[in-house]
Interface confidence: low
């Protein structure tokens, strides 16, 4: 048999707090336990769930957990079932609500001397005890002609008078806790002698020099006083107006009229109503001067046909906020269609070429109107006027390749050479019309060229091959002056290129034929053994059929190349002594000697008193100092060649002789002693 060891029991619970209904079962077989609420199975939720056999509540809910709970144990094999005793919750709760008018039926019916009943809609269990407040001050029974039961939710004012006016609120408490009204009730019982607002002035915005009207009316018995003030509390009356409000008129009905409004009139105007009794009623309204700023400029826009584009018009700052509209060709755009206005935006759906033109954004308010134009261009794909053509360009001359196209907007043209973008430099120039100019055409300019013409709408391209017509020229041009070494073999080369391979021949400038020991071999002049007579002027002639002939003149000099008879040696000198660096060279023409010391040429005219270069080429340095140390180079040169040789100079301190060394002991290194 199934036996309940622990059964659920009825208990107090607090709204929103934890609770547990216990249930423990003992049975021979395997049983499963479930719970019923008012006879229906309880489904587990995050809030309410079975915990073992017990039913756990994370937060008791007064609506969902009211009723009778029962624990049921069932043996599914035998079908035996046992039910626990019934258990329920006594849920304690309190919930805030508003203060509402119970009697009369509407606020409009509240009159002095009538009965007014307010109801406090705070509910709870157990039944709460209520406390009423007016303007935050607690009300007690029988206080100032009001009947109030603090245990009741109703507050009755009988009869209600102006003194009962105020903000009514209520609080209530019970075993669960306390709550106060979620929405309070303002009771306004007018004293006939109090000033009451009939018509309140409204803020106005006017343009300079226009007129502004403020309406203001109060009612009371007897009739109230009405006074207008501006900013610094200066009264405005028809008899006494502030100097800058001389054009102000106060009408009998309380309205204030300002004519020819100026900036100084802008500000806060106060209308004050004062009844026989009660506080003054102050109403405020502001007079704003209308204003409108300038509009920012539009950048010109380029759109492509078929696309959808929008242009936003930023309205200028202004008071009141300016209205914005778009116009095209003097006509206001509609709010729908293919070209229309949406908010502040100009919308062009599926753009056509005919949509191009000037569109104007207008903004206007009381202060005036502003406008700003935007130029819209509808881009078209370029078309050819002149494509680049295969061309033969002459070497050394300027060459042109044309790429003439037309489109809107004006197309941009770029050129490629062998698929590489041509950037403008000293040799390449792209004209505004797209033509490419190659300055001083070179042989390697013979290749493929491609031009691309583009607009935002698309691009077109074409290519052409350039063939360079090579000019007849020496490659390289022979040196106009050359030297040959006497009694040696020598060659003088001459080569040329042209559209056709040129023939090359040498001749003496005087027209005489070459001696038999001098041969002309395919443009190379060969001297088997140079003699003095071989010196003179020679001409290299290159020629071909289509281009004629060219000549190069060469003056050949026969020379004995330079050799050094005496070369400077590594030299060490005592500080303060004299150094001599010898150098002598021979050759024909007779070579000149120059010295370089410590990486600079020694100018014979600027040597100073310590240095001298002799006629034979030797260099002498008197009174040597440590800074004179270094490498010295002797350079020998003539019109035919140049040679150099170098040696180091060391300047050392003179040693003090030691006793162990005799007066004739040689120094440990080669010295020049003077």
């Amino acid at each position: 048999a199934i036996v309940f060891i622990k059964q659920p029991s009825s208990q107090d619970a607090l709204q929103g707090r934890r609770a547990l209904l216990r249930c423990e079962v003992e049975a021979p077989g395997l049983v499963h336990v479930y719970w019923l609420l008012d006879g229906a199975p309880v489904q587990d939720t995050e809030r309410r769930f079975t915990q073992g056999s017990s039913l756990s509540f994370a937060a008791v809910d007064r609506l969902q957990d009211s009723g009778t709970f029962q624990c049921v144990a069932r043996d599914d094999v035998t079908g035996e079932e046992a039910r626990s005793a019934n258990a329920s919750f006594n849920i304690k709760w309190i919930e805030a609500g508003p203060v509402v008018l119970k009697h009369p039926a509407s606020e409009a019916e509240i009159q002095p001397q009538t009965q007014v009943t307010l109801r406090c809609h705070i509910d709870g269990h157990p039944r709460p005890t209520y406390q009423w407040f007016r303007d935050g001050t607690p009300l007690s029974d029988g206080q100032s002609n009001n009947t109030v039961s603090s245990k009741e939710r109703n507050l009755t004012l009988r009869p209600a008078g102006p003194e009962h006016s105020g903000l009514y609120s209520c609080c209530a408490h019970n075993a669960f806790g306390q709550a106060c009204s979620s929405q309070n009730f303002t009771l306004s019982i007018a004293d006939e002698s109090f000033a009451r607002v009939v018509l309140a002035p409204q803020d106005v915005i006017v343009a300079r020099n226009e007129e502004a009207m403020f309406h203001c009316q109060f009612s009371a018995q007897p009739p109230p006083n009405l006074q207008w003030l501006f900013e610094d509390e200066t009264p405005i009356t028809n008899r006494s107006r502030p100097p800058h409000l001389r054009r102000a008129t106060v009408f009998a009905n309380g309205s204030l009229l300002l004519t020819q409004v100026r900036p100084r009139n802008a500000g806060v105007y106060r209308c004050i109503g004062q009844g026989q009794r009660g506080p003054p009623v102050i109403l405020e309204a502001t007079l704003h001067l209308a204003e409108i700023e300038d509009m920012p400029l539009f950048e010109p826009r380029v759109f492509t046909a078929g696309s959808e584009e929008r242009v936003t018009c930023l309205p200028p700052k202004g008071l009141p906020e300016p209205s914005v509209w778009w116009e095209h060709a003097g006509v206001r755009l509609p709010t729908h269609g293919r070209v229309y206005q949406k908010g502040h935006e100009l919308v062009l759906a599926s753009i056509a070429e005919s949509d191009a033109g000037v569109y104007t954004c207008h903004a206007a308010n009381l202060a005036g109107q502003r406008r700003q134009d935007v130029n819209i261009t509808v881009a078209t794909v370029p078309t050819w006027l002149k494509k680049p053509q295969d061309s033969q360009l002459e070497e050394g001359k300027p060459g042109y390749l044309h790429c003439l196209t037309q489109a809107t907007p004006k197309p941009t043209v770029v050129w490629y050479r062998n698929q590489m973008l041509i950037s403008e430099d000293s040799r390449f120039e792209v004209f505004k019309n797209g033509t490419l100019r190659i300055n001083n055409v070179e042989v390697y300019d013979g290749t493929w060229y491609r031009c691309v013409s583009s607009t935002p709408a698309g691009s077109i391209e074409a290519q052409a091959r350039v063939q360079v017509l090579e000019k007849l020229k020496f490659t390289p041009p022979p040196q106009p002056q050359q030297c040959m070494e006497f009694d040696k073999e020598a060659t003088v080369p001459c080569s040329a290129t042209g559209r056709e391979k040129p023939t090359i021949k040498w001749e003496r400038a005087d027209g005489s034929s070459l001696p038999e020991w001098v041969t002309d071999n395919a443009g190379t002049l060969h001297f088997a053994r140079v003699t003095r007579d071989d010196a003179g002027n020679y001409t290299c002639i290159a020629s071909n059929g289509p281009q004629g002939q060219i000549r190069a003149h060469v003056q050949l000099t026969v020379a004995v190349f330079i050799t050094f008879k005496v070369e400077p040696e590594r030299t060490t000198v005592y500080q303060g002594h004299t150094a001599l660096l010898q150098c002598e060279a021979q050759g024909d023409p007779k070579p000149l000697i120059q010295w370089k010391g410590k990486d600079r040429i020694l100018d014979p005219t600027k040597l100073g008193p310590r240095m001298h270069i002799f006629q034979n080429g030797s260099l002498v340095i008197h009174d040597v100092a440590p800074e004179d140390s270094g490498r010295y180079t002797c350079i020998a040169g003539n019109s035919c060649n140049i040679k150099h040789t170098e040696a180091p100079l060391y300047v050392v301190d003179k040693p003090v002789p030691e006793e162990s060394e005799g007066p004739g002991s040689p120094p440990p290194y080669k010295m020049i002693q003077t």
Epitope: E231, D232, E233, T234, P243, H244, Q260, R262, R264
Partner: antibody
Framework: EVQLVESGGGLVQPGGSLKLSCAAS????????MHWVRQASGKGLEWVGR??????????AYAASVKGRFTISRDDSKNTAYLQMNSLKTEDTAVYYC????????????????WGQGTLVTVSS | DIQMTQSPSSLSASVGDRVTITCQAS??????LNWYQQKPGKAPKVLIY???NLETGVPSRFSGSGSGTDFTFTISSLQPEDIATYYC?????????FGGGTKVEIK
């Protein structure tokens, strides 16, 4: 009877400072804007600046020639307006008047009903 | 700033003469203009406010007219006690500015 009495004038060296006072009586000082006007010897009138009432946040305004050097303040409890003059220049030498519309605290008071007798400020080395 | 140009800078007239002084504003100031009289050693005194309104207690021989930028001050019959310097002043905008003044003397 309305009275405005200036004081605090005197001889001061260029670069020096001086504070002028203007004691008011006979009208609602606290609700009135107070202005300072000066007049160099043999020359015309030059508006120096003004201070508005408490209701208008004691807003001040100055002529360009004195902006950054002169400061106008007021003490409503003493019915007194002040002109603090710093970094004085020789061209600031003048008779300084304090003046008011009397009942109005506006910037744009039509004209000055009330004037003090003036106080002489001499800036010289 | 609004410049006020007053002319002439000085004038000499006989007792009983009609005297006219003009004042020109560098921009439109509507009728926000006053005329002051200043006698030697004294503070200025307002004669005309709002371009054409005579201040209480001021003799009717003084008058003013004009609007916008051009204004005129007139003494219909000059009296010995009218010897003084007369100034116009605009209050259309800050800074408040005065004309250079017109010194009136009796021949």
């Amino acid at each position: 009877e309305v009275q405005l009495v200036e004081s605090g004038g005197g001889l001061v060296q260029p670069g020096g400072s001086l504070k002028l006072s203007c004691a008011a009586s006979g009208f609602t000082f606290s609700g009135s804007a107070m202005h300072w006007v000066r007049q160099a010897s043999g020359k015309g009138l030059e508006w120096v600046g003004r201070i508005r009432s408490k209701a208008n946040s004691y807003a001040t305004a100055y002529a360009a020639s004195v902006k950054g050097r002169f400061t106008i303040s007021r003490d409503d409890s003493k019915n007194t307006a002040y002109l603090q003059m710093n970094s004085l220049k020789t061209e600031d030498t003048a008779v300084y008047y304090c003046t008011s519309r009397g009942y109005s605290g506006y910037d744009y008071s039509s004209y000055f009903d009330y004037w003090g007798q003036g106080t002489l400020v001499t800036v010289s080395s | 700033d609004i410049q006020m140009t007053q002319s002439p800078s000085s004038l000499s007239a006989s007792v009983g003469d009609r005297v006219t002084i003009t004042c020109q504003a560098s921009q439109d100031i509507s009728n926000y203009l006053n005329w002051y009289q200043q006698k030697p050693g004294k503070a200025p005194k307002v004669l005309i406010y709002d371009a054409s309104n005579l201040e209480t207690g001021v003799p009717s021989r003084f008058s003013g007219s004009g609007s916008g930028t051009d204004f005129t001050f007139t003494i219909s019959s000059l009296q010995p006690e009218d010897i003084a310097t007369y100034y116009c002043q605009q209050y259309d905008n800050l800074p408040l500015t005065f004309g250079g003044g017109t010194k009136v003397e009796i021949k």
